[in-house]
């Protein structure tokens, strides 16, 4: 499967949509900044094989999809942009799932990188907890939007893994 190119294109489209979703000026939200601790050190220090990269990226996109599919999210963002963004994420998930089947030959993601997947889940738990603590305020969502954009950009090591042959 030609994942690097399709993923890169969809990823760019998702980031553009996410950038357009802002409703308030980020300048007014500086005091709401928060340390979510994206596990970039763990990712940077690891050379991902293709199947590993696919499964971790899948988890990141799935968690992002879940986060932006909540009722609170629907209230926070402009509906048509949110729908386009969710559709883009859903397509990425489909692409990754199709690729896993092709790469591994089974409909199961290998369990070799549970630690990385757990790190991603904990990261999104911290984001969800922050939103709850901030009562899903517009600024809290703005901070989360910026954080998701950053984490999407940070996953370069994972994207390098997509180009590798297992």
């Amino acid at each position: 499967c030609d994942l690097p190119q399709t993923h890169s294109l969809r990823n760019r489209r998702a980031l553009i949509l996410l950038a357009q979703m802002g409703r308030i000026s980020p300048f007014s939200c500086l005091k709401d900044r928060h340390e979510f601790r994206f596990p970039e050190e763990e990712f940077d220090g690891h050379q991902f094989q293709k199947t590993q990269a696919i499964s971790v990226l899948h988890e990141m996109i799935q968690q992002t999809f879940n986060l932006f599919s909540t009722e609170d999210s629907s209230a926070a963002w402009e509906q048509s942009l949110l729908e386009k963004f969710s559709t883009e994420l859903y397509q990425q998930l489909n692409d990754l799932e199709a690729c896993v089947i092709q790469e591994v030959g089974v409909e199961e993601t290998p369990l070799m990188n549970e630690d990385f997947i757990l790190a991603v889940r904990k990261y999104f738990q911290r984001i969800t907890l922050y939103l709850m603590e901030k009562k899903y305020s517009p600024c809290a969502w703005e901070v989360v939007r910026a954080e998701i954009m950053r984490s999407f950009s940070f996953s370069t090591n994972l994207k390098k893994g997509l180009r590798r042959k297992d």
Epitope: P26, F27, L30, D32, E147, M149, R150
Partner: antibody, heavy 121, light 107 residues
């Protein structure tokens, strides 16, 4: 390598206009805000304003509001600071620096080398 | 605007001395405080961000502490290259503001 490269020193007369630049490279220009800081001869640092190059949203310090204009051209990864009518009191070193916006990352971690503006008749 | 007040405005110290500079904000800024070092003719250099995080590449003799309104920059053992002017800056709300600076001179 992250770099902010500013335009060269300028010598101007009072009443003239001026636009100085700050070109970012080695990072995603639209992922960081660009701030401008003034330092008058022998004095401390004064924060002037900031721009988000992704949408050109701008904020100024009250002391500089209406005195200068901050802009950006994301297609060439460049931020600008401009004056429509310079005064002798605008004589200073001007620095640009990048800011991570709402992300939890170091504030103003990279600075331009500075542009010295001299206004004299 | 939030006012930032640094003290002292200047100090004389010797190599090996422990140096402490304080910065006070006119209202709470949580931990959104940065410290910069500036040498003559050079651009400022970030030393500490978010009150206590050491910027990459900065020697561990520099440390920052505090939250709310009172902050401290400490140089545990002053080195010859540390003679410079130090500024604090709040990034809690716009407009960002700097302290007036503290000049560290050789005794």
């Amino acid at each position: 390598e992250v770099q902010l490269v500013q335009s060269g020193a300028e010598v101007k007369k009072p009443g003239e206009s001026l636009k100085i630049s700050c070109k970012g490279s080695g990072y995603s220009f639209t992922s960081y805000w660009i701030g401008w800081v003034r330092q008058m001869p022998g004095k401390g640092l004064e924060w002037m304003g900031i721009i988000d190059p992704s949408d050109s949203d701008t904020r100024y310090s009250p002391s500089f509001q209406g005195q200068v204009t901050i802009s950006a051209d994301k297609s060439i990864s460049t931020a600008y600071l401009q004056w429509s009518s310079l005064k002798a009191s605008d004589t200073a070193m001007y620095y640009c620096a990048r800011h991570p916006g709402l992300n939890w990352a170091p504030d103003f971690d990279y600075w331009g080398q500075g542009t010295l503006v001299t206004v004299s008749s | 605007d939030i006012q930032m007040t640094q003290s002292p405005s200047s100090l004389s110290a010797s190599v090996g001395d422990r140096v402490t500079i304080t910065c006070r904000a006119s209202q709470s800024i949580s931990k959104f405080l940065n410290w910069y070092q500036q040498k003559p003719g050079k651009a400022p250099k970030l030393l500490i961000y978010f009150a206590s995080s050491l910027q990459s590449g900065v020697p561990s003799r520099f440390s920052g502490s505090g939250s709310g309104t009172d902050f401290t920059l400490t140089i545990s053992s002053l080195q010859p290259e540390d003679f410079a002017t130090y500024y604090c800056q709040q990034s809690n709300t716009l407009p960002f503001t700097f302290g007036q600076g503290t000049k560290v001179e050789i005794k």
